[in-house]
């Protein structure tokens, strides 16, 4: 229904705390360089204004759209052009073009230092002194680094952060309590960030229909006892909510997400038997719980998929009558029977089925033509199954770090033109798939592996789009979203690449490496490994192993030496010479 004042409506629905958090996230995602203090000032002004509109919806400017109100606030920032350059040009436009312009200027890789977690004692002190400000900083720092982070989910992580600090800051050993708990929140949040970026990419590049197909498959897997009409409703709502968040309409997105959770909890009987525990929780936790819900049990007596979609004599008639509904029903029926498949695979199968009907329904004997379609799915199913098998075996053999290195070599050979930091980031993330998925039961491995890899590869595509350097990457990234992972998997060594010349300084290290945390040490070594592959793209596994082993020993030896600087200065050139020789 229409409201006189959109901002008053959202304030009342969301409550002051969530309203302020969402406004802070919105501003931080649009203007990623602004300091927290500047954003919090704007948030307070917007909140005060919203309160005046709650008191009187007819007050001046209360009838303006939220985009207009937010955009006007952002455009009133002094020195906007000095800090943001081109983005300031957006302010000359009218809504909705102005908001579109802001969205186009979101930077997926902002030039910001990595978020450093303060010492436990310092964290607890600032948290206890001002919890609101502490959590505000958290929202700001995450949102500006991840401009597409799903806003209501970020509020949930802030709540988790709050819980951990409340619990751990009373402990005697604060660090021992905080570190593992905050690491777990961080890991989940980072995965959430790449997953949501993929959703926004899907929406931006391929539109609502493609996203809705993804949602139908996912919902059907989770709620196999729900009927198609119910799945369609959920998928339509989820599509609308994600469109809003991806489009910067964070207040509407969060409000609609809460509404959907309410609907699901009121209609458990027609959706799933697993919802009750989620439905007893407060709003943010409820929505998050529902988003992560385990699959319901598959109905025992489901007929063969062939009955309706192959054997029925009226397949072509039913398809012609309502193509999208018929294909949607196929996707629903196939997905509810296969929680063990990835969504990407299910969408590939639906696409294959559609292509088969398009071809066969135009022929003389359609049933004879489409009669073998289900058998033709087999190679499409086998390919990702083999991918999971070989990669999980490799992970089990090498462990996470070793597996990351194997992936790094593979991807540097596929796309050596891509910048080393991007390759290292992608390989480290791709390599984590082992830890994340290979330890799961067999039936959960494939969906975990492929859907996670797709999200990570989307991040690679997003970064590559900014500065395209590899034709092969551009080709894989330009195609359909569900074909991306198979496209990247099929890439081989880039034969067109002219190897980088050997630069000694790339492989020159100093004693500062000794004091780096383990993660940073690994990144340094992986940077060197990528550079080695760029120098010798056809180096064998044994050659790379020798050089990297030698390198690890060198670092270890010099870090234990009494005079570290001297060791690095004298042993370094020897290492470089030996490496050149080993790779000759």
């Amino acid at each position: 229904e229409a409201h006189k004042s959109e901002i008053a409506h959202r304030f009342k629905d969301l409550g002051e705390q969530h309203f302020k958090g969402l406004v802070l996230i919105a501003f931080s995602q649009y203007l990623q360089k602004c300091p927290y203090e500047e954003h919090i000032k704007l948030v307070q002004e917007v909140t005060d204004f919203a309160k005046t509109c709650v008191a009187d919806e007819n007050a001046e400017n209360c009838d303006k759209s939220i985009h207009t109100l937010f955009g006007d606030k952002l455009c009133a920032i002094p020195k906007l052009r000095d800090n943001y350059g081109e983005l300031a040009d957006c302010c000359a436009k009218q809504e909705p073009e102005r908001n579109e312009c802001f969205l186009q200027h979101k930077d997926d890789n902002p030039n910001l230092p990595p978020f450093q977690r303060p010492e436990a004692e310092a964290m607890c002190t600032s948290f206890q002194e001002n919890p609101t400000s502490f959590l505000g900083h958290y929202l700001h720092e995450v949102a500006r680094r991840h401009p597409y982070f799903y806003a209501p989910e970020l509020l949930y992580y802030a709540e988790k952060y709050n819980e951990v600090l409340t619990q751990c800051c009373t402990e005697s050993d604060k660090a021992a309590c905080l570190t593992p708990k905050l690491d777990a929140v961080k890991e989940k949040a980072l995965v959430a960030a790449v997953r949501q970026r993929m959703k926004c990419s899907s929406m931006q590049r391929f539109g609502e229909r493609a996203f809705k197909a993804w949602a139908v498959a996912r919902m059907s897997q989770r709620f196999p006892n729900a009927e198609f009409a119910e799945i369609t409703k959920l998928a339509t709502d989820v599509t609308k909510i994600n469109k809003e968040c991806c489009h910067g309409d964070l207040l509407e997105c969060a409000d609609d997400r809460a509404e959907l959770a309410k609907y699901m909890c009121e209609n458990q009987a027609t959706i799933s038997s697993k919802l009750q525990a989620c439905c007893d929780k407060p709003v943010l936790q409820k929505s998050q719980c529902l988003a992560e819900i385990e699959h319901d049990n598959i109905p025992a007596d489901l007929p063969s998929i062939a009955a309706d979609f192959v054997e029925d004599k009226e397949v072509c008639k039913n398809y012609a009558e309502a193509k999208d509904v018929f294909l949607g029903t196929f996707l629903y029926e196939y997905s509810r029977r296969h929680p063990d498949y990835s969504v990407s695979l299910l969408l590939r199968l639906a696409k294959k089925y559609e292509a088969t009907l398009e071809k066969c329904c135009a022929e003389g004997d359609p049933p004879a033509c489409y009669g073998t379609v289900l058998a033709e799915f087999q190679p499409l199913v086998e390919e990702p199954k083999n991918l999971v098998k070989t990669n999980c075996e490799l992970y089990e053999k090498l462990g996470e770090y070793g597996f990351q290195n194997a992936v790094l070599v593979r991807y540097t050979q596929k796309a050596p033109q891509v910048s080393t930091p991007t390759l290292v980031e992608a390989a480290r993330n791709l390599g984590r798939v082992g830890t994340k998925c290979c330890t799961l039961p067999e039936a959960q491995r494939l969906p975990c592996v492929e859907d996670y890899l797709s999200a990570i590869l989307n991040r690679l595509c997003v970064l590559h789009e900014k500065t395209p350097v590899s034709e092969k990457v551009t080709k894989c990234c330009s195609g359909s979203l569900v074909e991306r992972r198979p496209c990247f998997s099929a890439l081989t060594v880039d034969e067109t690449y002219v190897p980088k010349e050997f630069k000694a300084e790339t492989f020159t290290f100093h004693s500062d490496i000794c004091t780096l945390p383990d993660k940073e040490k690994q990144i340094k070594k992986q940077t060197a490994l990528a550079e080695l592959v760029k120098h010798k793209p056809k180096a064998t596994e044994d050659q790379l192993k020798t050089v990297m082993g030698d390198f690890a020993q060198f670092v270890d030896k010099c870090c234990k030496a009494a005079d570290k600087d001297n060791c690095f200065a004298t042993e370094g050139p020897n290492l470089v010479a030996r490496s050149k020789e080993a790779l000759a």
Epitope: E227, A229, K233, L234, T270, E314, E321, V325, F326
Partner: nanobody, 118 residues
């Protein structure tokens, strides 16, 4: 083209029974949720009942619970509403409706009038 044709309405005394039928064509009946909606004279539309495609789950408005029974025969593309213990307040035009989404209907029939009066 989608067609929904209701029948079975008429004049009945309070406490009496009627069975409404709705014959569907132009779509794959067995794939869709179907339902009955009614409109009493001078009133808005009111949900009466709906049924899942496979018939395994049914919904009833509180005002008809225990008196009305919805059913379907997918082999005949037909939806039914058995109405028992009819009351004066059940007087309305009853429409058969096809659902494309849980809380939304995209096609309606022409309606059949049910009058409960002594």
């Amino acid at each position: 083209e989608v067609q929904l044709l209701e029948s079975g309405g008429g004049l009945v005394q309070p406490g009496g029974s009627l069975r409404l039928s709705c014959t569907a064509s132009g779509f794959t009946f067995r794939h869709y949720r179907m339902g009955w909606v009614r409109q009493a004279p001078g009133k808005g539309l009111e949900w009466v009942s709906w049924i899942r495609p496979d018939g395994t789950f049914t919904y009833y408005a509180d005002s008809v619970k225990g008196r009305f029974t919805i059913s379907r025969d997918n082999s005949k593309n037909t939806l039914y509403l058995q109405m028992n213990s009819l009351r004066a307040e059940d007087t309305a035009v009853y429409y058969c409706a096809k659902s494309y989404m849980a809380d939304r209907f995209d096609y309606w029939g022409q309606g059949t009038l049910v009058t409960v009066s002594s």
